[in-house]
Structure formats: structure tokens, C-alpha cells
């Protein structure tokens, strides 16, 4: 048999070998594909079937408009002229080209020694699915579950058959200083089909600094409350990935979960002291923020005590 | 939404013609293939005749084939029966319905007109 | 040419009760097979498609099943408006071909 590879919506002609070229003939099309459970012999004098696949004057098979459904298996038997019967067989593949693919999210630099996402690359309209892959430098990179991670997402489109790929790639620089390219490519795995690139995106490796300072908010500003009243500590950390941020009270650390805020309901006066948080990052151990006074009395009763963050509400460490 | 709309004279003498006409909106009018069938009084349905979403295919049963034409218009989102050598038992209401390829069967149908042959 | 033979041609049944009708294909036609509501005077209106698919806007109390070259219109909950004929039609061969009819009437 014959393999046959169609673009979807597009025209496909199969020709039946050994047919005489104008009636009288005797032939006889068959079909096994996706809108049949069997083998449907086609009518010679057309029928509902005409709209998807229609034999010609010549004994070839017309299918107007292919469609993933008309994926299988065609034969012909015919007797030529001599009065051989003559035999063709087909195997009908379709595809469909996406759209080019795209990075959506691309990361605007990348930090050295901790995982970074690159982005997600997007490819829409595929038939068969086909396959996304990921370049560095022009090179095919090979995730290894470690420095090079790629989360994959098939879908397929309930209508239309046609498929949506997605790729995210997450990759750990080993140093700073660099400007490494990265690209995708999507490739249906069809001969003679070259891969569609997306555009690529080149990105800065910088070194993982410290971060630029922690900011502990107290609310109410000046940490002075009245009995039965809510105080709300917050960690305002800038570094990426966020880091966990424990709680110390008057040198202590508090049996809580990591979060970047503290929240203190009805205040009684066992909750006064000295607060911090503690932010401790993968690459650069802990940072403890200024600390801050936290006072439960009547209100209006005195001013900021000695230590306390005062009007700003802020305690700063560049 | 969907509007398919017969018209065409209702009594005609045997060995007369007459023509149907059903006028289509609210689809793509040439995507489709279009179907007229008919509904002799108090009996069942009865396929009439079929045409390709082109127009360069016909097709009939042996009951009508030879005396009635089936056409369109895409144009003009008409589709047409011509009815020549009527015979009393063609007396039915006529139906214009979309579809009549695998693809579809028959989705959508006219309200049907009634056709007498009679003398 | 394919015939469909549809059964029962008429049926008696009360509102709630479940109702079945079969048309028999006289050869494979796949599930090339429509279901159709008729009421007096009006056009027929389609049910179900390709065998067992519920058309736009059909209540769910309707269904079409498949086995082999016979197919079953089922009714699960008879309605006041359901009271109505009922066609199968083959559209695998031409000529496209009807079922005999079903009339549902009120017991």
C-alpha cells in the first residue's frame, strides 16, 4: 500500500490503478476510516457519501475537503481492459501546521544558582499534536529533571480536533554574566516538514545579591494598640523566589508557620514586646528586619514608647 | 437563527408543471447540501431530492427521477424544485429541508407547501 | 434500496411513562441515522443525530441508541407535548430513506 499524508480542509485525489479511464468501468471504492466502524463500499452512482468522498468520471476518489475523520484505509479494485482485476491500497494520514509558536511570560533576566522560569512556549492548531522542544544558544536542550525542568501540557480542541501544546521551561544558571538565548520550536514529525521557531529571547544571568532590604509594617503606625485590638505585622521582603519569614519576639522565635505576615487578634498585654521577622533565602542564609515595639494600652494614655517604629509605621534595613 | 421558506402555486392539473421555491437565511448558504421531501396527505415522509453544496450534483429516487429538477441559487440563498408531468400522487405538502449528506442528514426543514394535482 | 422498518406504528401511554421506539435497518448504515418529532400541520423537527447524539435545544428525556443495524428512540419521562409521530431516516444511502412513522397517543 501507499502512504498518503493530506493538509486538513485541503483536496486529495486517489487514483485507481487499472481503471479504464472513462465509464464503462468496474471498480469498486472502499473506505475504513474514522466515519465508518467497518469497510463502506462507496456507491458508483454517489450518495450521502459524495460530500466526503465522491468517485470521479475517471474511477479516481475525490475527497473534497480532508478532515481528520477521513484518517484510514482506501481501496480500489478494478478490472482493466484486459479483464485483470488490478488492486490499490492507501493509507491517508492528515495533518494541519499551528500557527507559529510563541513564548508567552518570558522572564525579564534570570538569577544564577536558583531555579528561574524562562517562560511558556505556545503552539495552537496542530494535527497531530507534534512535539515542542527548547534551544539555548541554537543547541536542543535536554531536561534533566535538575538545572533543566519542562512542565508539558497537551490539549485538544473539543470542535475541532486540533491541538494546543504548552511547554514551560525552568532552568538554573550555573553563573552570572551571561546572556543566554533561548528558543522553542514546535515540529509535527511529518518528512519534509521543517521545524516552526519561535522568535527567541535573549536574557541577563545576574549573580544572586542580597536582597535590597527588609520593611517591617506595623499597623496600627506606632505598634500602639488597645486591648482587644488587631495588630498586623508584615514582612515586605523584595527577592525572588520569595523567601520564608519566621517571627521573633523579644529574641525568641515564635512556634508559627512561615508567612510574611503576623496577625495578633485581641490584643492583651501578654502580646507587648519586641517584634522581628526572620527571612531566610536559599542562596544567602537569614536576614532579621529592625525591630519593632508593640504597646496594649487605653488609647490617647502616651506617646510612642522608647524603640518603636514611630510615625512611619516602618522599621528599614538597607 | 436558521429560516428556510417555501412558496410556489398549490393546485396544478395532472401532466402540469410547477416550480418551488424556498428561500434560506441565517447559515452559509453554499456550505450546505439541501433536501426537498414530501408528505402525501395522512401518510409518511418521502425523499424527493437532493443537491450538492455546489450545485454540480443532483440526485433523485426512481419515483420522481426524469420529470423533477432540483437547483439553487447561492447567490441568491435559493433553492428550487421544478415539478414537470404531475401525477395525482405527487399531492403532498413539499418540504425544503438542510442537509442530506452524511455529514449532516436533515437538520433544519421549511414549514412545507402544500401541492394538489388535481383536475 | 435500504428499508427501514419502524415499530410500533402507534402507541397508547400516559404522561410519565417511559416509551420506546425501533427502526431496523434492512443493511449497515452506520450511524447514519436521524430521529424526527412530527405534529400535526407542523414541519418535522429533528431529535437526535448520527444514532445517538441529542440535537440543539432537545430535552435530555430523549435519547437514541445503537446496536448493530437496529436503532431505539427512547422517551425516558412521556410529556404532555410529547404526544406527537415519530420517523427514523437513513441518510448512509441514497435513496434516503424514511421510517414508517410512530403516532404516540394519550392512553
Known amino acids: 500500500g501507499q502512504n498518503i499524508t493530506a493538509r486538513i480542509g485541503e483536496p486529495l485525489v486517489l487514483s485507481c490503478k487499472g481503471a479504464p479511464k472513462k465509464p464503462p468501468q468496474q471498480l469498486e471504492w472502499k473506505l475504513n476510516t474514522g466515519r465508518t466502524e467497518a469497510w463502506k463500499v462507496l456507491s458508483p452512482q454517489g450518495g450521502p457519501w459524495d460530500s466526503v468522498a465522491r468517485i470521479l468520471p475517471n474511477g479516481s476518489l475525490l475527497l473534497p475537503a480532508t478532515g481528520i475523520v477521513d484518517e484510514g484505509t482506501f481501496r480500489c479494485r478494478a478490472t482493466n481492459r484486459r479483464g485483470k482485476e488490478v488492486k490499490s491500497n492507501y493509507r491517508v494520514r492528515v495533518y494541519q501546521i499551528p500557527g507559529k509558536p510563541e513564548i508567552v511570560d518570558p522572564a525579564s533576566e534570570l538569577t544564577a544558582s536558583v531555579p528561574n522560569k524562562v517562560g511558556t512556549c505556545v503552539s495552537e492548531g496542530s494535527y497531530p499534536a507534534g512535539t515542542l522542544s527548547w534551544h539555548l544558544d541554537g543547541k536542543l536542550l535536554i531536561p534533566d529533571g535538575k538545572e533543566t525542568l519542562v512542565k508539558e501540557e497537551t490539549r485538544r480542541h473539543p470542535e475541532t480536533g486540533l491541538f494546543t501544546l504548552r511547554s514551560e521551561l525552568t532552568v538554573i544558571p550555573t553563573q552570572g554574566g551571561t546572556h543566554p538565548t533561548f528558543s522553542c520550536s514546535f515540529s509535527l514529525g511529518l518528512p519534509r516538514r521543517r521545524p516552526l521557531n519561535t522568535a527567541p529571547i535573549q536574557l541577563r544571568v545576574r549573580e544572586p545579591g542580597p536582597p535590597e532590604g527588609i520593611q517591617l509594617l506595623v499597623e496600627p503606625e506606632g505598634g500602639i494598640v488597645a486591648p482587644g485590638g488587631t495588630v498586623t505585622l508584615t514582612c515586605a521582603i523584595s527577592a525572588q523566589p520569595p523567601p520564608q519569614v519566621h517571627w521573633i519576639k523579644d529574641g525568641a522565635p515564635l512556634p508559627l508557620a512561615p508567612s510574611p505576615v503576623l496577625l495578633l487578634p485581641e490584643v492583651g498585654h501578654e502580646d507587648e514586646g519586641t517584634y522581628s521577622c526572620v527571612a531566610t533565602h536559599p542562596s544567602h542564609g537569614p536576614q532579621e528586619s529592625p525591630p519593632v515595639s508593640i504597646r496594649v494600652t487605653e488609647t490617647g494614655d502616651e506617646g510612642p514608647a522608647e524603640g518603636s517604629v514611630g510615625e512611619s509605621g516602618l522599621g528599614t534595613l538597607a | 437563527e436558521v429560516q428556510l421558506v417555501e412558496s410556489g402555486v398549490g393546485l396544478v392539473q395532472p401532466g402540469g408543471s410547477l416550480r418551488l421555491s424556498c428561500a434560506a437565511s441565517?447559515?452559509?448558504?453554499?456550505?450546505?447540501?439541501m433536501t426537498w421531501v414530501r408528505q402525501a396527505p395522512g401518510k409518511g415522509l418521502e425523499w424527493v431530492a437532493s443537491?450538492?453544496?455546489?450545485?454540480?450534483?443532483?440526485y433523485y429516487p426512481d419515483s420522481v427521477k426524469d420529470r423533477f429538477t432540483i437547483s439553487r441559487d447561492n447567490a441568491k440563498n435559493s433553492l428550487y424544485l421544478q415539478m414537470n408531468s404531475l401525477r395525482a400522487e405527487d399531492t403532498a405538502v413539499y418540504y425544503c429541508?438542510?442537509?442530506?449528506?452524511?455529514?449532516?442528514?436533515?437538520?433544519?426543514w421549511g414549514q412545507g407547501t402544500l401541492v394538489t394535482v388535481s383536475s | 434500496d435500504i428499508q427501514m422498518t419502524q415499530s410500533p406504528s402507534s402507541l397508547s401511554a400516559s404522561v410519565g411513562d417511559r416509551v420506546t421506539i425501533t427502526c431496523r435497518a434492512s443493511?449497515?448504515?452506520?450511524?447514519?441515522v436521524n430521529w424526527f418529532q412530527q405534529k400535526p400541520g407542523k414541519a418535522p423537527r429533528r431529535l437526535i443525530y448520527?444514532?445517538?447524539n441529542l440535537a440543539d435545544g432537545v430535552p435530555s428525556r430523549f435519547s437514541g441508541s445503537r446496536s448493530g443495524t437496529d436503532f431505539t428512540l427512547t422517551i425516558s419521562s412521556l410529556q404532555p407535548e410529547d404526544f406527537a409521530t415519530y420517523y427514523c431516516?437513513?441518510?448512509?444511502?441514497?435513496?434516503?430513506?424514511f421510517g414508517g412513522g410512530t403516532k404516540v397517543e394519550i392512553k
Open positions: 429541508a438542510r442537509g442530506g449528506d452524511i455529514t449532516n442528514g436533515l437538520d433544519y
Open positions: 441565517g447559515f452559509t448558504f453554499n456550505n450546505y447540501w
Open positions: 443537491i450538492d453544496n455546489s450545485g454540480d450534483n443532483t
Open positions: 443493511q449497515d448504515v452506520g450511524i447514519y
Open positions: 448520527r444514532a445517538t
Open positions: 431516516l437513513e441518510f448512509d444511502e441514497h435513496p434516503l430513506t
